[in-house]
């Protein structure tokens, strides 16, 4: 009879988001009497291992299509052909390989948010940096100098409180103020640099009694 | 030449703590993890616990949870298997092995290890 | 957690045909990675994803898995095949890797 696939249940994840380098395997698992073809195409045309630099596996009994060591330039659709002289059944499958490209830190949206304390108790700010390389993680805050916000060229006073480099793409840093005063109040930052740029979050601390 | 060098063999005490290096080679060392697997003499493989060279992110087998820590140096492609409070029974080869991801359309996604270093001998003894 | 059984040990005459068994509770709805130990040497993997072989492995391997048994299969199996043979699935529920207790293989002769 026609070609029909053994395993459907398990088809149904047509789209593979995968990183880079790791290793593709398309299988469309059928049976027919007589046994079917599979053939395989991307893009809409025949598929062959001299298509792509490492070439790809095809192995028939298995119904399968390995790739090695995905580029993005794998990027595709990758459709099964199985075929018998009683009919013909496809599926296409959309492979996406994630690339790991480095951009500036991103900060988390809404972090660290402002807040009010009483005098004399312990507050803590929040701030969820994101960085492909490696991230050097600042909280600073800004101050006065002879009375001044700004020096001569316009940039603001800042004190650095804490600073390191992060060896986490994603680090999630807190700053802890213990037994706050009112000469704590203010404007602080936490900024996050790397080699391709910066990013930055200005945030309050409002000090009553 | 993809390759994975480890650090020499260690002669350590009970309680003491031992720290086994594997440098990559031959690869970018960020696209794929490292585990880290050990074999007693005459046992079988026993897996410790495996880090993200891309995010630092751990998992350590509940075995070795709080006595292990595993870190890598992105600077050197270098992974660290750190292993405290040293006994007897943890006398064994420790093996770090890169760590691949195998995607499959029906099965989902599946880890393995496709190249090994070649081993660290750690003798505990008093 | 998965727990994956192997035989400790087997003996196959050079020629022929070696069968290893790596038996886990619906392991045929797990992917199965085989590795191969020399004495004194660090494992090598010969076969991923059940049934897919890296390059340099030759065709007398092969592999399946059904049920509740992955299969690694050798034939016209040489003295140089003489070693430990594990098997390895990732357990995706806990993110662990799991490997079998090994099977020593043994040529005869």
């Known amino acids: 009879g026609a070609p029909y696939w053994t395993r459907p249940e398990r088809m149904d994840k047509k789209l593979l988001a995968v990183p880079a380098a790791n290793t593709v395997r398309f299988r469309c698992p059928a049976a027919g009497n007589p046994t079917p073809s599979i053939s395989w195409l991307k893009n809409g045309r025949e598929f062959r291992g001299e298509h792509r630099i490492g070439g790809i596996k095809l192995a028939h009994q298995q119904w399968s299509l390995v790739m090695e060591s995905v580029v993005p330039s794998d990027r595709g659709n990758y459709t099964c052909v199985v075929e018998n002289k009683f009919g013909s059944i496809r599926q296409t499958y959309t492979l996406d390989v994630l690339e790991r490209s480095p951009h500036r830190p991103i900060l988390q949206a809404g972090l660290p948010a402002n807040q009010t304390a009483v005098l004399g108790s312990d507050v803590e700010f929040h701030c969820k940096v994101y960085s492909d390389a490696q991230p050097h993680i600042q909280w600073l805050k800004h101050v006065e100098v002879n009375g001044s916000k700004v020096g001569p060229d316009g940039t603001p006073y800042v004190t650095v409180l804490k600073s390191w480099i992060s060896e986490s793409v994603e680090a999630d840093v807190r700053l802890r103020l213990a037994n706050v005063s009112e000469r704590d109040g203010g404007e602080y930052l936490c900024r996050a640099t790397n080699f391709i740029g910066v990013a930055e979050k200005a945030f309050w601390l409002s000090v009553h009694g | 030449e993809v390759q994975l060098v480890q650090s020499g063999a260690e002669v350590k005490k009970p309680g003491a703590s031992v720290k086994v290096s594997c440098k990559a080679s031959g690869y970018m060392f960020t696209s794929y993890g490292i585990s880290w697997v050990r074999q007693a003499p005459g046992q079988g493989l026993e897996w410790m616990g495996w880090v993200s060279t891309y995010n630092g992110d751990t998992n350590y087998a509940q075995k070795f949870q709080g006595r292990v820590t595993v870190t890598t140096d992105t600077s050197t492609s270098t992974a660290y298997m750190e292993l405290r409070s040293l006994r007897s029974e943890d006398t064994a080869v420790y093996y770090c092995a890169r760590v691949l991801g195998y995607y499959d359309s029906i099965d989902g996604y599946y880890y393995g290890m496709d190249v090994w270093g070649q081993g660290t001998t750690v003798t505990v003894s008093s | 957690q998965s727990v994956l059984t192997q035989p400790p040990s087997l003996s196959v005459a050079p020629g022929k045909t070696a069968t290893f068994t790596c038996g886990g509770n619906n392991i045929g709805d797990k992917s199965v990675h085989w590795y191969r130990q020399k004495p004194g040497q660090a494992p090598v993997l010969v076969m991923y994803?059940?049934?897919e072989r890296p390059s340099g492995i030759p065709e007398r391997m092969s592999g399946s898995n059904f049920g509740n048994t992955a299969t690694l299969t050798i034939t016209r199996v040489e003295a140089e095949d003489e070693a430990d043979y594990y098997c390895q699935v990732w357990d995706s529920g806990s993110d662990h890797v799991v490997f079998g207790g090994g099977t020593k293989l043994t040529v005869l002769g």
């Open positions: 994803l059940d049934t």
